[in-house]
C-alpha cells in the first residue's frame, strides 16, 4: 500500500573540524521510494556540487572537506506524492583549532605613548587570547589590557614594559602561539642635572656639570655663547643609561654655557637643553627681576629687521643680556652668509625676532613668541633646502657651529595665530613673493601644527608688542 514518507532518524547537530568530513543522515520510510532534497540555510544543494556527496537514495549527505563557511542549518525534505512532504533540520557547527591570523610584530615606542601589539585569531569555539612577557603570563592592570580583538594595548608605556612578548590563543581543540616579538621603549633625552650658574672673579677655574639620560643614551654637546666650546676640557662617562659630562673652564670673560643632550628615535631627534651663566663679579649689573626686562633695541645687527624703537625682551639669564643676545644674532648671521638670497632675509627676520622677542613692559615682562605660521614659512618655504642641509649636517656632526640649536625656534612649539591671533608676533619684514605663496598650502583647522597657512598681507602684519598683563 502507498505510504507517506516518515523521517525515522531526524537530523542532529553535527560538530566538524575544518578539512574533515561531516555527514548528515536522513533515514526515511515510505512507499513508493521518496525523492529527497537537501538545503543549507534554505538554499538548495545541487546534486552535482562536487563539495558534497549524496548517497543511499539521498538519505546521506556528506560534506567532503569542511570549510569554516559551511556552518549553518541543513535540512532534508522527503516527498513521494503520498501525503505531504516531510522535513528534518540540523545544524553544522564548524569547529576550528585556534589560528593566529594577524600576529604581533616588533615595536619601538617612545615612553609615555600608547603601544598596541596586534593578535587577531580565528577558531571555534572562539579562542581566548592571553599574553606572555618573557617567561611569565602577563597580568592586566589599569595601563595594560587585552582588547576584545586579542590585541595587547599598553597605555602610557613605561621603560619596564620593554621586553619579549608573545600571544597565546586557546580553545577546547588546541592552543596556538605567536612568534616572540620585541617591544623596545625609547625615552626622550632628559637632563637630570643642569649646570649651575656662577658669579666668579676673573681668572677662576669653574667646572660645569651636566648629567642626562634617555634611551638610546644621549650625547652631550656644550655651547659657549652660541658656538661649540673652543676652550676648556670635557670629560664624559656613561653608566646605567646616564651620561655625565664635565666642562672645565678658565674664566676670562662672561658667557652663556648650554648643555645640549640629544638622542635619536628613528629619523627624529629629541633634544634637552640647560644653560648656565658665568659672570665676572665686576661685570655684574643689577637687573629689574630674575627673568628679564624690556628695553628699546640698541644693537646694530637687527636694526633693519626690528621695528623702529621696538621694545624687546632682554633675558637676565645672561650676564650681559644686550651683549649676549647681540652676539647670538651676530654669530648666527655669519652662518647665513652662505644661504640663498631667498632664504637669507627670511632667516634674518626669524633670528632677530626670536632672539630679541617682542616685549610687554611692566613688573613681569612677557616676551611674545613668533607665530608658528611665520616660523614654518621660513622653514618650509623660504629656507626649505637650507633647513634640511642644516639638520642633516647637525645629525652627522658636520656643523661647524651649533649656534642654530639656540637661535632657531622649534616651530611646532610656537603658538599659532590661527587659534589666537594675539598670542604671537608676525615677521613684518618677510618680503615674500606672492607667486611663491601660491604653492603654499592653506591651513586646515584640524592640523595647524603641520600645514602652513597663507601669510597675511604685509599691511596687516606690522610688528606688534603686547603690553597686556604687565601689571600684577
Amino acid at each position: 500500500l502507498p505510504k507517506a514518507p516518515v523521517i525515522t532518524t531526524p537530523l542532529e547537530t553535527v560538530d566538524a573540524l575544518v578539512e574533515e568530513v561531516a555527514t548528515f543522515m536522513c533515514a526515511v520510510e515510505s512507499y513508493p521510494q521518496p525523492e529527497i532534497s537537501w538545503t543549507r540555510n534554505k538554499i538548495l544543494i545541487k546534486l552535482f556540487d562536487t563539495r558534497y556527496s549524496i548517497r543511499e537514495n539521498g538519505q546521506l549527505l556528506t560534506i567532503l572537506s569542511v570549510e569554516d563557511s559551511d556552518d549553518g542549518i541543513y535540512c532534508c525534505t522527503a516527498n513521494n506524492g503520498v501525503g505531504g512532504a516531510v522535513e528534518s533540520c540540523g545544524a553544522l557547527q564548524v569547529k576550528m583549532k585556534p589560528k593566529i591570523t594577524r600576529p604581533p610584530i616588533n615595536v619601538k615606542i617612545i615612553e609615555g605613548l600608547k603601544a598596541v601589539l596586534p593578535c587577531t585569531t580565528m577558531g571555534n569555539p572562539k579562542p581566548s587570547v592571553s599574553w606572555i612577557k618573557g617567561d611569565s603570563p602577563l597580568r592586566e592592570n589599569s595601563r595594560i589590557a587585552v582588547l576584545e580583538s586579542g590585541s595587547l594595548r599598553i597605555h602610557n608605556v613605561q621603560k619596564e614594559d620593554a621586553g619579549q612578548y608573545r600571544c597565546v590563543a586557546k580553545n577546547s581543540l588546541g592552543t596556538a602561539y605567536s612568534k616572540v616579538v620585541k617591544l623596545e621603549v625609547e625615552v626622550f633625552a632628559r637632563i637630570l642635572r643642569a649646570p649651575e650658574s656662577h658669579n666668579v672673579t676673573f681668572g677662576s677655574f669653574v667646572t660645569l656639570h651636566c648629567t642626562a639620560t634617555g634611551i638610546p643614551v644621549p650625547t652631550i654637546t656644550w655651547i659657549e655663547n652660541g658656538n661649540a666650546v673652543s676652550s676648556g676640557s670635557i670629560q664624559e662617562s656613561v653608566k646605567d643609561r646616564v651620561i655625565d659630562s664635565r666642562l672645565q673652564l678658565f674664566i676670562t670673560k662672561p658667557g652663556l654655557y648650554t648643555c645640549i643632550a640629544t638622542n635619536k628615535h628613528g629619523e627624529k631627534f629629541s633634544t634637552a637643553k640647560a644653560a648656565a651663566t658665568i659672570s665676572i663679579a665686576e661685570w655684574s649689573k643689577p637687573q629689574k627681576d630674575n627673568k628679564g626686562y624690556c628695553a628699546q633695541y640698541r644693537g646694530e645687527v637687527c636694526n633693519a629687521v626690528l621695528a623702529k624703537d621696538a621694545l624687546v625682551f632682554l633675558n637676565t639669564s645672561y650676564a650681559d643680556p644686550e651683549e649676549a643676545q647681540e652676539l647670538l644674532v651676530h654669530t648666527a648671521w655669519n652662518e647665513l652668509k652662505v644661504v640663498s638670497p631667498v632664504c637669507r632675509p627670511a632667516a634674518e627676520a626669524l633670528l632677530c625676532n626670536h632672539i630679541f622677542q617682542e616685549c610687554s613692559p611692566g613688573v613681569v615682562p612677557t616676551p611674545i613668541p613668533i607665530c608658528r605660521e611665520y616660523c614654518l614659512a621660513v622653514k618650509e618655504l623660504f629656507c626649505a633646502k637650507e633647513w634640511l642641509v642644516m639638520e642633516e649636517k647637525t645629525h652627522r656632526g658636520l656643523y661647524r657651529s651649533e649656534m642654530h640649536l639656540l637661535s632657531v625656534p622649534e616651530c611646532s612649539k610656537l603658538p599659532s595665530m590661527h587659534w589666537d591671533p594675539t598670542a604671537c608676533a608676525r615677521l613684518p619684514h618677510l618680503d615674500y613673493n606672492k607667486e611663491n605663496l601660491k604653492t603654499f598650502p592653506p591651513m586646515t583647522s584640524s592640523k595647524p601644527s603641520v600645514d602652513i597657512p597663507n601669510l597675511p598681507s604685509s599691511s596687516s602684519s606690522s610688528f606688534s608688542v603686547s603690553p597686556t598683563y604687565s601689571m600684577t
Epitope: 621695528a307 621696538a310 621694545l311 611692566g362 613681569v364 612677557t366 611674545i368 612649539k413 610656537l414 603658538p415 599659532s416 587659534w419 589666537d420 591671533p421 594675539t422 598670542a423 595647524p448 601644527s449 596687516s460 606690522s462 610688528f463 606688534s464 608688542v465 603686547s466 603690553p467 597686556t468 598683563y469 604687565s470 601689571m471 600684577t472
Partner: antibody, heavy 115, light 113 residues
Framework: EVQLVESGGGLVQPGGSLSLSCVAS????????MNWVRQAPGKGLEWLSV???????YYADSVKGRFTISRDNVKNTLYLQLNNLKPEDTALYYC?????????WGQGTQVTVSS | EIVLTQSPSSVTASIGEKVTINCESS??????????LNWYQQRPGQSPRLLIY?????QSGVPDRFSGSGSGSTTDFTLTISSFQPEDVAVYYC?????????FGPGTKVELK
C-alpha cells in the same frame, strides 16, 4: 576644532568653595594664555583672571585673594578655585582662550551662591 | 583701571540698515602703533564671540559687513555693521587689552525693528 568644556559649577552657600574645571581640546593648550570671565544673570561680562604659559597668574581686584587660577598642561585642563564665595559671585563662568583678545569661549558653567 | 563707555545702550535696526556702536576709553590704549581694543558679539543664549581685535582687524570667519575703526592715540572706537541681518541681533561689547585688569564696556543691545 577648539573645544573648551567647563564643569564644576553648582549651588553653594555663602562662604563656601567650588572648583571649576575647563578641559581644552583641538589646540596645543600649553602654548596659550587662558582666562576666566563671568557673566552675572542679565548683566555684562567681567574678566576675572588669566594664566600665562609659565603659569604666572593675574587677577581682577574683585576676586584677588579668593579665587585661584591654575593649569595642568598634561591634562589640558584649566582650573579656577573659588573660595569664600559671596552672593554677588553668582554668574555663568566662562573659560576663554586668548592673550590680548578673548578668542575662543566655552559654553560656561553656572555658579549660584545662595543660602 | 581703564573704564569703557558704550553708546547707545540699545538700538533697533531694520534689515539692510547700517548700525554704528561707539566705545569710549578713559585713556589711550595705543601701544606700538596698535590699539588694544576688541569687539565681541553675544547672541541670546550663546557665549560671546570675538569679532574684531586690535581695533580694526576682523577675526577669521567674521562676515565683512562687520568693521572696526579707531586709530592713532584716539580714545573713541566704532563698530559698524554695514548691512544689518536678522542673525546680528545680539549684545555687542568692547574690551580693552592695554593693561590688566582687562575691562569690558557695558554692552549695546541691537534688536530687529
Amino acid at each position: 576644532e577648539v573645544q573648551l568644556v567647563e564643569s564644576g559649577g553648582g549651588l553653594v552657600q555663602p562662604g563656601g568653595s567650588l572648583s571649576l574645571s575647563c578641559v581644552a581640546s583641538g589646540f596645543t593648550f600649553s602654548l596659550y594664555y587662558m582666562n576666566w570671565v563671568r557673566q552675572a544673570p542679565g548683566k555684562g561680562l567681567e574678566w576675572l583672571s588669566v594664566i600665562d604659559t609659565h603659569s604666572i597668574a593675574y587677577y581682577a581686584d574683585s576676586v584677588k585673594g579668593r579665587f585661584t587660577i591654575s593649569r595642568d598642561n598634561v591634562k589640558n585642563t584649566l582650573y579656577l578655585q573659588l573660595n569664600n564665595l559671596k552672593p554677588e559671585d553668582t554668574a555663568l563662568y566662562y573659560c576663554v582662550l586668548g592673550r590680548t583678545a578673548l578668542v575662543r569661549w566655552g559654553q560656561g558653567t553656572q555658579v549660584t551662591v545662595s543660602s | 583701571e581703564i573704564v569703557l563707555t558704550q553708546s547707545p545702550s540699545s538700538v533697533t535696526a531694520s534689515i539692510g540698515e547700517k548700525v554704528t556702536i561707539n566705545c569710549e576709553s578713559s585713556q589711550s590704549v595705543l601701544y606700538n602703533q596698535k590699539n588694544y581694543l576688541n569687539w565681541y558679539q553675544q547672541r541670546p543664549g550663546q557665549s560671546p564671540r570675538l569679532l574684531i581685535y586690535w581695533a580694526s582687524t576682523r577675526q577669521s570667519g567674521v562676515p565683512d559687513r562687520f568693521s572696526g575703526s579707531g586709530s592713532g592715540s584716539t580714545t573713541d572706537f566704532t563698530l559698524t555693521i554695514s548691512s544689518f541681518q536678522p542673525e546680528d541681533v545680539a549684545v555687542y561689547y568692547c574690551q580693552q587689552a592695554y593693561n590688566a585688569p582687562l575691562t569690558f564696556g557695558p554692552g549695546t543691545k541691537v534688536e530687529l525693528k
